[in-house]
């Protein structure tokens, strides 16, 4: 039960941080105009990954795209990537995570193989998380970079009187959507993890068991007294219990899907 | 046809208080930031205030600050100008005006005056 | 606050003229979001509001003639009308609709000789 659950909470998790990279990665407002210590403009600038855009006093509003590709700086470009990265994980992390989850039959599949479906989507979490939050980071960094450069030369004097003020950029609203996001993802898809440690069966380790014959003592695995016993291939897949008691070669056959269900 | 009509001004003593209205008509009112403008009897423009379409934004002149206030109403398509502590430097037409494109004023009321004598 | 100088404050012309009026703002009104100036140039006739000719300093407001033309960036701005009719005779206003306050210029009258 708590398996499930932690299954299922990690791809809701996870599905609400690849839902928000995506709108992140969408978003216009990854910088915005700088209006601490400004002069106040009746026009307002921001950025997105793929578009700036305008915003006037008057409401209207213009953007334009970034129609070039060899001439955007290379950074922006990496952070492109490891947005689009991360997506395409998360998406595919979410496609075989639909599959492997306890609570959806499909088929007579096996709890090994949900279990190692549940590994692989909860990887793939991570690293899309781990993308998200670097792309993120990179698209900060370059920000602040940028930021104190044009602090430096705020003020570029023209011709002695005249005065340009130089547009500041500040973290935007999509680079926090962003990292929460990325966070997200990152935490459904340690939750996958662990409930895939869950799902699979632990090998039992049956300790020999001594049994005393009259006459002199021999000692029997498990396995050793199949025809006095009725253990034999007659029950070979026998489903005893559900809750986890197996057939002696199920034992053996790692992992049981008779395991938690 | 877009129209803006002003009303409200008058000759008013140093200290008093008027408060103007700007009629709009023939546009979606609330899809518009509006501002005021006067003219000095020396025929000088100058801004008085700025209101954003939903009337969340104000801005004023520094000179009118805290004796002027812009506002709206989007329900009954009408901008106002609360004025109080009126000085003989408020002596002007005030025009209310809306803004559309590159923030500039495309329209215009016919202006109302305001006399401020004792 | 940003000052708008226009210069000449008055002008004398004869129909069919060239025109060419200046207007300096004491700060670039230049954005480099979108690399347009905001500049807006007016016109008025005695006893009429403003009339909008020309705003992102060079785009001309609909149902204004061809002869009005804007030019211009940063701080130095200018409004050319190519041949001057009659109903041109008017006073000529910029405005800087960058920076609040939004300022105007003092004007440039256009009359006839």
């Known amino acids: 039960m708590a398996v499930t659950a932690c299954q299922g909470l990690g791809f809701v998790v996870s599905l609400i941080g690849i839902a928000g990279i995506i709108a992140a990665t969408c978003m216009d407002q990854w910088s915005t105009q700088d209006l601490y210590n400004n002069p106040v403009t009746a026009v307002f600038n921001y950025q997105g990954l793929w578009r700036s855009c305008v915003r006037e006093s008057s409401g209207f509003t213009e953007c334009r795209g970034y129609f070039t590709l060899l001439g955007l700086p290379a950074m922006l470009q990496a952070v492109r990537a490891l947005m689009i990265v991360g997506i395409v994980l998360g998406a595919i992390g979410l496609l075989v995570s639909i599959f492997a989850l306890k609570c959806i039959r499909i088929g007579s599949m096996e709890d090994s193989a949900k279990a190692n479906m549940t590994l692989t989507s909860g990887i793939m979490f991570i690293v899309s998380g781990l993308c998200a939050i670097a792309g993120v980071s990179v698209f900060a960094n370059m920000l602040v970079t940028n930021f104190w450069m044009s602090t430096a030369n705020m003020y570029t004097g023209m011709g002695g009187m005249v005065q340009t003020v130089q547009t500041r950029y500040t973290f935007g609203a999509a680079l926090f959507v962003g990292w929460v996001a990325g966070g997200l993802t990152l935490i459904g898809g340690v939750m996958m993890c662990i409930a895939c440690r869950g799902l699979a069966p632990e090998e039992t380790n049956y300790k020999a068991v001594s049994y005393h014959a009259s006459g002199h003592s021999v000692a029997y695995k498990p396995g050793g007294f199949k025809a006095s016993t009725g253990f034999g291939s007659n029950t070979k897949n026998k489903k005893i219990y559900d809750g986890g008691a197996r057939t002696e070669d199920e034992v053996q056959s790692y992992p049981s899907k008779h395991d938690y269900v | 046809e877009v129209q803006l009509v002003e009303s409200g001004g008058a000759l008013v003593k140093p200290g008093g208080s008027l408060k103007l209205s700007c009629a709009a008509s023939?546009?979606?009112?609330?899809?518009?930031?509006m501002s005021w403008v006067r003219q000095t009897p020396e025929k000088r423009l100058e801004w008085v205030a700025f209101?954003?379409?939903?009337?969340?934004?104000?801005y004023c002149l520094d000179s009118v600050k805290g004796r002027f206030t812009i506002s709206r109403d989007n329900a009954k398509n009408t901008l106002y100008l609360q004025m109080s502590s009126l000085r003989s430097e408020d002596t002007a037409l005030y025009y209310c005006?809306?803004?559309?494109?590159?923030?500039?004023?495309?329209?215009w009321g016919q202006g109302n005056s305001v006399t401020v004598s004792s | 606050d940003i000052v708008m100088t226009q210069s000449p404050s008055s002008l004398t012309v004869t129909a069919g003229e060239k025109v060419t009026m200046s207007c300096k703002s004491s700060?670039?009104?230049?954005?480099?979001?979108?690399?347009?100036?905001?500049l807006t140039w007016y016109q008025q006739k005695p006893g009429q509001p403003p009339k909008l000719l020309i705003y992102?300093?060079?785009t001309r407001e609909s149902g204004v003639p061809d002869r009005f033309t804007g030019s211009g960036s940063g701080t130095d701005f200018t409004l050319t009308i190519s041949s001057v009719q009659a109903e041109d005779l008017s006073v000529y206003y910029c405005?800087?609709?960058?920076?609040?306050?939004?300022?105007f210029g003092a004007g440039t009258k256009l009359e006839l000789k």
């Open positions: 005006a809306r803004h559309d494109k590159g923030n500039a004023l495309d329209y």
């Open positions: 023939g546009f979606t009112f609330s899809k518009y930031a």
């Open positions: 209101i954003s379409n939903g009337g969340s934004y104000t």
């Open positions: 700060q670039s009104l230049l954005n480099s979001g979108n690399q347009k100036n905001y």
């Open positions: 992102w300093a060079s």
């Open positions: 405005q800087n609709d960058y920076f609040y306050p939004l300022t």
